[in-house]
Interface confidence: medium
Amino acid sequence: GHSLFTCEPITVPRCMKMAYNMTFFPNLMGHYDQSIAAVEMEHFLPLANLECSPNIETFLCKAFVPTCIEQIHVVPPCRKLCEKVYSDCKKLIDTFGIRWPEELECDRLQYCDETVPVTFDPHTEFLG
C-alpha cells in the first residue's frame, strides 16, 4: 500500500522518465495506488502511442500519477495543458471511443503555470 499523506516514489514505468519522481495517491480519479493507476492509464495508450499531442505523456502522467512535492503538496495538471492535449487528441479520442474521465474535464482544472504549479492539500482536495 501507500503511506497516507506522504509522497512516494513513482513505480509506473511510463512515468519514471518524467521530470518529477515522487507522487501521491489517491489521484484525481480516486485510484488508490499506482498499480490501479497504471491499469487505468492503459485505456489512453493509443493516444500516447500515436503521439496525438506533444504533451500527451506529460498530461497522462500528471493526471494518473500526480506530482507530489514537499510531502503533501499534490500538483494536478494545469488547465491549459489539459485543453491543449484534449484539443490535439480529440479526433483520436473519438476514433478509439476513449471515455475522458469527468475528473479530467479541463474546466475542472485550474489555470496555472506548468513550471510553477498550483499545489493543494490532498486532505481537502482529493478526499473531500
Epitope: E51, P54, N55, K84, S87, D88, K90, K91
Partner: antibody
Framework: QVQLVQSGAEVKKPGASVKVSCKAS????????MHWVRQAPGQGLEWMGR????????NYAQKFQGRVTMTRDTSTSTVYMELSSLRSEDTAVYYC????????????????WGQGTLVNVSS | DIQMTQSPSSLSASVGDRVTITCRAS??????LNWYQQKPGKAPKLLIY???SLQSGVPSRFSGSGSGTDFTLTISSLQPEDFATYYC?????????FGGGTKVEIK
C-alpha cells in the same frame, strides 16, 4: 512574437546530404509539432514529415523514409532536417512550419512558417 | 494517400470580384481542411483552418465552407493584395497532402 528562423541557402552535389536548421522563439518550443514542407521551383507544396520536440518522435512521409532524419535540440529550441542521397529533383525551398492548436479539436494548420531555405542540388 | 484536387488551377479576376476556389478530397476528411495563401518568394500563410474557421488576423472577406470531400474558399471582394496562389491541405491523416494550387491573377 513567434519566429521560425532557418539556416541559409545550400548548394550540394548529387549523392551528398544537407542539414537545414530551424530555430524557434516566442512560444514554448515543446508545445507544438514542427513540420517540414518543401516546394520545388514553380511547383506546389509537399509535406515531408514532422517531429515532436517534446519526445523527439518523428513521422515521415513514405516518399522520404530512409532518406530524411528530423531531430531537435531543446536547449536551443532548434529543429533540424537532414536529407541524404540528394538528387537534382530535391532542389527546392525547404520550410519548417509550426502546428499550433485552436481549441477546435481538429488537426490544425501550420500557423507559423520559417522563411525557407533554398537547397540547390547540382553537379 | 489522400489526393487533393483543386480547381481551377488559375483564374483571372478584377478588384472587387467575388472569387471561389474549390478543393476535392479523394476520400472523406470530415472538416480537416486548411487553406493557405502564398505570394512569390514568401512562405505560405494560413487563412482558414478546420474548413471554415478564420485564422486570427485574416480579413473577413475570406471564408471557407464544406465538409466530407468538397470544400470551397471564397473571397467576397477581391483586393489588390489578394493576388496570390492558394492551396488547400488536408490534415485528416498522414501523409498530409496539399492541393496543386490556384493562381489568382489580375484580369
Amino acid at each position: 512574437q513567434v519566429q521560425l528562423v532557418q539556416s541559409g541557402a545550400e548548394v550540394k552535389k548529387p549523392g551528398a546530404s544537407v542539414k537545414v536548421s530551424c530555430k524557434a522563439s516566442g512560444y514554448t518550443f515543446t508545445n507544438n509539432f514542427m513540420h517540414w514542407v518543401r516546394q520545388a521551383p514553380g511547383q506546389g507544396l509537399e509535406w515531408m514529415g514532422r517531429i515532436n520536440p517534446n519526445s523527439g518522435g518523428t513521422n515521415y512521409a513514405q516518399k522520404f523514409q530512409g532518406r530524411v532524419t528530423m531531430t531537435r535540440d531543446t536547449s536551443t529550441s532548434t529543429v533540424y532536417m537532414e536529407l541524404s542521397s540528394l538528387r537534382s529533383e530535391d532542389t527546392a525551398v525547404y520550410y519548417c512550419a509550426s502546428q499550433n492548436y485552436y481549441g477546435s479539436g481538429s488537426y490544425p494548420g501550420f500557423d507559423y512558417w520559417g522563411q525557407g531555405t533554398l537547397v540547390n542540388v547540382s553537379s | 494517400d489522400i489526393q487533393m484536387t483543386q480547381s481551377p488551377s488559375s483564374l483571372s479576376a478584377s478588384v472587387g470580384d467575388r472569387v471561389t476556389i474549390t478543393c476535392r478530397a479523394s476520400q472523406s476528411i470530415s472538416s480537416y481542411l486548411n487553406w493557405y495563401q502564398q505570394k512569390p518568394g514568401k512562405a505560405p500563410k494560413l487563412l482558414i483552418y478546420a474548413a471554415s474557421s478564420l485564422q486570427s488576423g485574416v480579413p473577413s472577406r475570406f471564408s471557407g465552407s464544406g465538409s466530407g470531400t468538397d470544400f470551397t474558399l471564397t473571397i467576397s471582394s477581391l483586393q489588390p493584395e489578394d493576388f496570390a496562389t492558394y492551396y488547400c491541405q488536408q490534415s485528416y491523416s498522414t501523409p498530409l497532402t496539399f492541393g496543386g494550387g490556384t493562381k489568382v491573377e489580375i484580369k
